[in-house]
């Protein structure tokens, strides 16, 4: 055959669906790899040909599209399953192609079982929710073009493995389910199960996301640096290791990137001719506001080591601030002998 | 540390009214939701009502829907009861309490104040 | 409406002592349940949140179990102060519903 523009298998598209569910995929060249859409593929007399290798298998097959009560068929440029079995896993290409032009792509779709409180392998997207906040909804993912809009579908909502019924703080509405109050313990996995009918048939969508509750952006703060402080004094002697913690709170920001980082005189760590090492840790709240620990490490200071400047800086969403830690060169402890003899007079 | 004072209990007739006021003092009420919970004599506890912080949604147990309202003063750092038609089966100690914010758990509690419905 | 029952009713210990008691609900209600201590003429005391969190500054020797339908509340060394009423709370379900109480009284 002649050449075609071949995009690999995009990974990207790792779909997963439910055993025994329906399933509608879009075929991806149309959404990422390609500037124009189907209809204009089509009205161009181009053609979508569809093809899969089954899992652990190298062989490309056709797709057979004459299976009882149609049960996968194309649409445009989407490939429909009504419903999937276990073993439609496999990779599928979609080809789009004429006489002069051809583009194809592959992706792997992966068939999942789940289990009556709908524990599965499938890849769940996390929402997040803000703790001492006003009510906040989650929506259904993923439901749109399985039925007409004069299609009206029952909708339940589980909580983990407890369907949600007149609960104190959630309220399902539909597609959506409304949190008056997220509370920590609200953490955890929500399932829609999404019932319609369709030519005679009962099809049942099931999706599920984790929520994770999270500090609230009213409470949030600029970050607060615990340490180094007023309070502690870092008093060594050449030779010693000085050891300086940077200890420092950060709220918790949607899409706010922290930063803690050292400066000596002025400077990164890195610009100065000194043998210092940084390690960092990071802890996190229950409401994943975030601590951020940097410890500054100097082996073996020297007294010039003692006299330079050293500052914690952070930043975040909220600001950035910056503390300078207090580095004394210790005083030696007079020695008797010479030192307090003298001062006695002894001779 | 927050504290919560209830006031306004007292005798009154079936089919009279009473207003219950729950101040904070040391702070604002904070938390999720203010509760009231009410106990009879040499009873148990039993929920009567709540009003979120956030949204000032209002909820209430069946026996006192229609009779009831809770509100909340934020100016003043005042929560509310209105009882409305009173039983004598109404007669308890009622008790304001904070719902937390992070957790469900009533956190803190006031004292208490007696309504005795009474001919 | 969720029905929390207790037990024992009434529990006659003595100091030193290792105690439970048991709050089953009607339904499953998760861990959304919390336990509190009530003393004469005074208010209730929160101990345990999320059926099995101590609730800050209650003492140690306090503890909680349980999820689903079955918790339990332990006091593993009886206090002279521990004699009271004890309630279980469930929150997850519209009404919130109390146990009728567990009474810890004196042997």
């Known amino acids: 055959s002649e050449r075609c523009d071949d995009w690999g298998l995009d990974t990207m598209r790792q779909i997963q669906v439910f055993e025994d569910e329906p399933a509608r995929i879009k075929c991806p060249l149309f959404e990422h790899f390609l500037k124009f859409n189907y209809s204009t593929a089509h009205s161009a007399g181009l053609t979508l040909i569809w093809y899969w290798t089954r899992q652990d298998r190298d062989l490309e097959e056709p797709i057979n599209f004459r299976l009882p009560e149609n049960r996968i068929s194309k649409e445009k440029d989407v490939l429909w399953f009504r419903p999937t079995l276990l073993n439609d896993t496999g990779n599928y290409t979609c080809m789009l192609r004429n006489t002069t032009y051809c583009s194809k792509v592959a992706f792997p779709l992966e068939v999942v079982q789940k289990d009556s409180c709908f524990n599965s392998p499938m890849k769940l997207p996390v929402h997040k929710l803000y703790i001492e906040y006003g009510i906040q909804r989650i929506t259904c993912p993923n439901v749109d073009g399985y039925f007409p809009s004069s299609v009206k579908p029952t909708i339940t909502w589980y909580m983990g493995c407890y369907k949600i019924q007149n609960f104190n703080n959630v309220i399902p509405e539909g597609m959506n389910l409304s949190f008056l109050i997220a509370f920590i313990s609200n953490n955890g996995n929500y399932t829609c199960v999404v019932t319609y009918p369709e030519n005679g048939r009962t099809f049942h969508l099931t999706r599920t996301l984790t929520v994770k509750v999270v500090g609230s952006p009213k409470n949030a703060v600029p970050p607060v640096i615990h340490s180094p402080n007023d309070h502690v004094v870092y008093e060594k002697e050449p030779g010693e290791e000085l050891l300086i913690p940077c200890t420092v709170y950060f709220s918790f920001l949607m899409d706010s990137r922290n930063e803690v980082w050292w400066t000596i005189d002025g400077k990164k760590p890195d610009d100065i001719p000194i043998d210092v090492t940084i390690n960092e840790s990071i802890s996190h709240s229950r409401t994943e506001d975030e601590t951020r620990t940097q410890i500054l490490s100097i082996k073996k200071v020297t007294s010039e080591d003692l006299k330079r400047s050293y500052v914690c800086h952070a930043r975040s969403a909220k600001g950035e601030v910056a503390k300078a830690a207090t580095v004394k060169q210790k005083v030696p402890a007079p020695r008797y002998t010479v030192e307090l003899a003298c001062g006695f007079g002894a001779t | 540390e927050v504290q919560l004072v209830e006031s306004g209990g007292g005798l009154v007739q079936p089919g009279g009214s009473l207003r219950l006021s729950c101040a904070a003092s040391?702070?604002?009420?904070?938390?999720?939701?203010m509760h009231w919970v009410r106990q009879a004599p040499g009873k148990g506890l039993v929920w009567v009502s709540r009003i979120l912080t956030y949204g000032g949604i209002a909820t209430y147990a069946e026996s006192v829907k229609g009779r009831f309202t809770i509100s909340r003063d934020n100016a003043k750092n005042t929560l509310y009861l209105q009882m409305n038609s009173l039983r004598a089966e109404d007669t308890a100690v009622y008790y304001c309490a904070r719902g937390s914010s992070e957790y469900p758990k009533f956190d803190i509690w006031g004292q208490g104040t007696l309504v005795t419905v009474s001919s | 409406d969720i029905q929390m029952t207790q037990s024992p009713s009434t529990l006659s210990a003595s100091v030193g002592d290792r105690v439970t008691i048991t709050c089953r609900a009607s339904q499953s209600i998760s861990s959304w349940l919390a336990w509190y201590q009530q003393k004469p003429g005074k208010a209730p005391k929160l101990l345990i949140y999320d059926a099995s969190s101590l609730e800050s500054g209650v003492p140690s020797r306090f503890s909680g179990s349980g999820s689903g339908t079955e918790f339990t509340l332990t006091i593993s060394s009886l206090q002279p102060e521990d004699f009271a009423t004890y309630y279980c709370?469930?929150?997850?379900?519209?009404?919130?519903?109390f146990g009728q109480g567990t009474k810890v009284e004196i042997k």
């Open positions: 040391g702070g604002t009420f904070g938390g999720s939701a």
């Open positions: 709370h469930q929150l997850l379900i519209y009404p919130h519903t």
